[in-house]
């Protein structure tokens, strides 16, 4: 009887081991199938649109990442409140699961646009390095479904890179003119969004709780029109210490106003950055490593 019980235990352990191995094989097969599917759909560096079919709807890129899709590219997502799905670039590097909300890379897109364009989004949603603004509506839908971290990757023309990260990034609704809310800063580029770098500056240069402005919808704290003068849509105050939607110049520039792609705490007002990526991911994101 004792021998029988021992044999049962041994067989149970063996079954568990086999189940684990089968599960591992299933995961491996799923990954290989996905990679194969992605390679088939991925047209090299230029076209990175990845069609997952109608397998399921994803609220953001972190869900896609945790469902086993580890290749960066354009995917379709549908945040909880969003009436329709839309295309977005998912950055599956840097820990993975990043939803890219803005990109500047070469000045190929015009960012001097009106309220409707900034509301709905515009740009190149096909090419890997395509410039775009995801749309204030979409930013609102995304950032109200849970608490997000915003990471901003910045690069200059001298091959230097810095980043700024903000917890609890939120964009308000249309009624509140897509107001910006950000939490605790960390990073290497300095805190230009909250304007914490200088007490004299914070009240007029901070972007915290600023409403979004465009040339045709002025919600800034300035007697003039920041968006018109700086030729971009942004959360202007009076006017800015950061403007990542500014005019694309090649490094140092001169203009009537500081209208370049500016991150004051790194390169000041008179240097326009080479590239910018604004991307978000849930605060509590844990990569699914199974």
């Amino acid at each position: 009887l004792e021998d029988c019980a021992q044999e049962q235990m041994r067989l149970r352990a063996q079954v568990r081991l086999l189940e684990t191995r089968v599960k591992q094989q299933q995961v491996k097969i799923k990954q290989l199938l996905q990679e194969n599917e992605v390679q088939f759909l991925d047209k090299g560096d230029e076209n990175t649109v990845i069609d997952l079919g109608s397998k399921r709807q994803y609220a953001d890129c972190s869900e896609i990442f945790n469902d086993g899709y580890k290749l960066s590219g354009f995917y379709k997502i549908k945040p909880l409140q969003s009436p329709a799905e839309f295309s977005v670039y998912c950055d599956m590097s840097d820990g993975g699961g990043w939803t890219v909300i803005q990109r500047r890379s070469d000045g190929s897109e015009n960012f001097n646009r009106g309220w409707k364009d900034y509301e709905n989004g515009f740009g190149n949603f096909v090419q890997k390095h395509g410039e775009y603004w995801l749309g204030n509506k979409n930013l609102h839908f995304l950032t109200t479904q849970e608490d997000y971290t915003l990471k901003i990757d910045l690069a200059d023309f001298e091959k230097n890179s810095r980043y700024a990260q903000y917890k609890n990034f939120k964009v308000g609704d249309e009624k509140n003119f897509y107001e910006l809310n950000i939490g605790e800063y960390s990073g290497t580029a300095g805190d230009s969004l909250a304007g914490n770098f200088h007490p004299e500056v914070q009240w007029w240069a901070s972007h915290q709780r600023m409403k979004f402005s465009t040339w045709d919808r002025d919600h800034d704290n300035y007697e003039g029109n920041c968006a018109e003068e700086d030729q971009s849509g942004w959360w202007f105050n009076r006017c800015h210490s950061a403007n990542l939607n500014g005019v694309y110049y090649s490094g140092p520039y001169t203009a009537k106003t500081d209208n370049g792609i500016v991150w004051y705490t790194w390169h000041g007002w008179w240097y326009s950055l080479k590239s910018v990526v604004m991307k978000i991911r849930p605060n509590d994101f844990i990569p699914n490593v199974i």
Epitope: H198, E200, V201, W203, W204, A205, Y222, E223, G224, C226, E229, N237, R238, C239, T254, A255, K256, T257, D258, W269, W270
Partner: nanobody, 127 residues
């Protein structure tokens, strides 16, 4: 409140030059739009010139265009008003004023936007 100090005023002959300085201690003038104003005896204070917080934009009153030049020296935390071809009508007390953030993008230069003022420096143009 920003503490501003003007200097460089004095007595000068017609056709002569002066350079006025506006200096702030303990504050970074780069963060402020700076305006120069004059007040002649018995008259209202009026705008002469201004320079935006980031230094990209400057505006001049019609009466001084081509004669006066406004500039900044960030290292010295000072804004200058270089005045050439001075005329007896330029005689006045000259004030500098600060406005936090963006400003000075259009004419005319009005006093109401500016929130911090210096004590003024006297400029007398006479032979």
């Amino acid at each position: 409140q920003v503490q501003l100090v003007e200097s460089g005023g004095g007595l000068v002959q017609p056709g002569g030059s002066l350079r006025l300085s506006c200096t702030a201690s303990g504050f970074n003038l780069d963060f402020y739009t700076i305006g120069w104003f004059l007040q002649a005896p018995g008259k209202e204070r009026e705008g002469v010139s201004c320079i935006s917080n980031s230094g990209g934009s400057s505006v001049y009153a019609d009466s001084v265009k081509g004669r006066f030049t406004i500039s900044r020296d960030s290292a010295k935390n000072t804004v200058y008003l270089q005045m050439n071809s001075l005329d007896p009508e330029d005689t006045a007390v000259y004030y500098c004023a600060a406005l936090a953030g963006r400003g000075c993008m259009r004419s005319p230069i009005t006093t109401d936007e500016y929130d911090s003022w210096g004590q003024g420096t006297q400029v007398t143009v006479s032979s």
